[in-house]
Interface confidence: low
Amino acid sequence: PEPPTACREKQYLINSQCCSLCQPGQKLVSDCTEFTETECLPCGESEFLDTWNRETHCHQHKYCDPNLGLRVQQKGTSETDTICTCEEGWHCTSEACESCVLHRSCSPGFGVKQIATGVSDTICEPCPVGFFSNVSSAFEKCHPWTSCETKDLVVQQAGTNKTDVVCGPQDRLRA
């Protein structure tokens, strides 16, 4: 019969014949022959392979480096990688969670829209006209400018997104 040019799912083509792939959690030791099956071996401790494969080496489990603020969220198995997460109060810098950063503060001119939680960083928003923030804070919202009128005063210096209005006494008209 003609040698195959393609193989079924969970098989691979080698030396003109279809061999079984190794199952997840196992690595390839030797290809099949006309007389023998594919030989596979389980991955060692701290190793994994998460697909049907013909890899000769298993992958090392991810190391959750405490010096980067990481800790193990889910321990790896022979079929799954370790999942890292950040220590309390820190946030992953990426979806892969390869390192962590402290949650950020909102700079002057920005206020906190949403306070940080264990899983989400601080969300900042620019202070709109009529509001200001003069501090770098992980808590403070933008504050409204002082209303000079309600204090029977006048605006001496306009407010910005970083500074409050400065109020002063009204000029009295002389008789």
Epitope: E87, E88, G89, W90, L102, H103, I115, A116, T117, G118, A138, F139
Partner: nanobody, 117 residues
Framework: EVQLLESGGGLVQPGGSLRLSCAAS????????MHWVRQAPGKGLEWVSS????????YYADSVKGRFTISRDNSKNTLYLQMNSLRAEDTAVYYC??????????WGQGTLVTVSS
């Protein structure tokens, strides 16, 4: 298991006072900053106050500055919020929260404070 249990809420008249307590267990209380956060009916969460692990540094939202005092007793694993000169706008469910580096990872069930005449 981390547990935070608030108490001390209730109905109080405008201008009145209340003292909230938060009993903490399941973690090393004296190692963590602690926080009070509140949620008024139909509103989002609002940060109220925070205190560092030793109780020497405190932070307050502008809306409560000068009226509320946060404190802690590390020997009793308890966080407090003394609320004076209460106003109708202070009506909310008050939560204590455990934190590290000023974020919150565990919350209590909350205690309701109603300020009404």
């Amino acid at each position: 298991e981390v547990q935070l249990l608030e108490s001390g809420g209730g109905l109080v008249q405008p201008g009145g006072s209340l003292r909230l307590s938060c009993a903490a267990s399941g973690f090393t209380f004296l190692s963590y900053p602690m926080h009070w956060v509140r949620q008024a009916p139909g509103k989002g969460l609002e940060w109220v106050s925070s205190i560092d692990s030793r109780g020497s540094v405190t932070y307050y939202a502008d809306s409560v500055k000068g009226r509320f005092t946060i404190s802690r007793d590390n020997s009793k694993n308890t966080l407090y919020l003394q609320m004076n000169s209460l106003r109708a706008e202070d009506t909310a469910v008050y939560y204590c929260a455990k934190g590290h580096s000023w974020t919150f990872d565990y919350w209590g069930q909350g205690t309701l404070v109603t300020v009404s005449s």
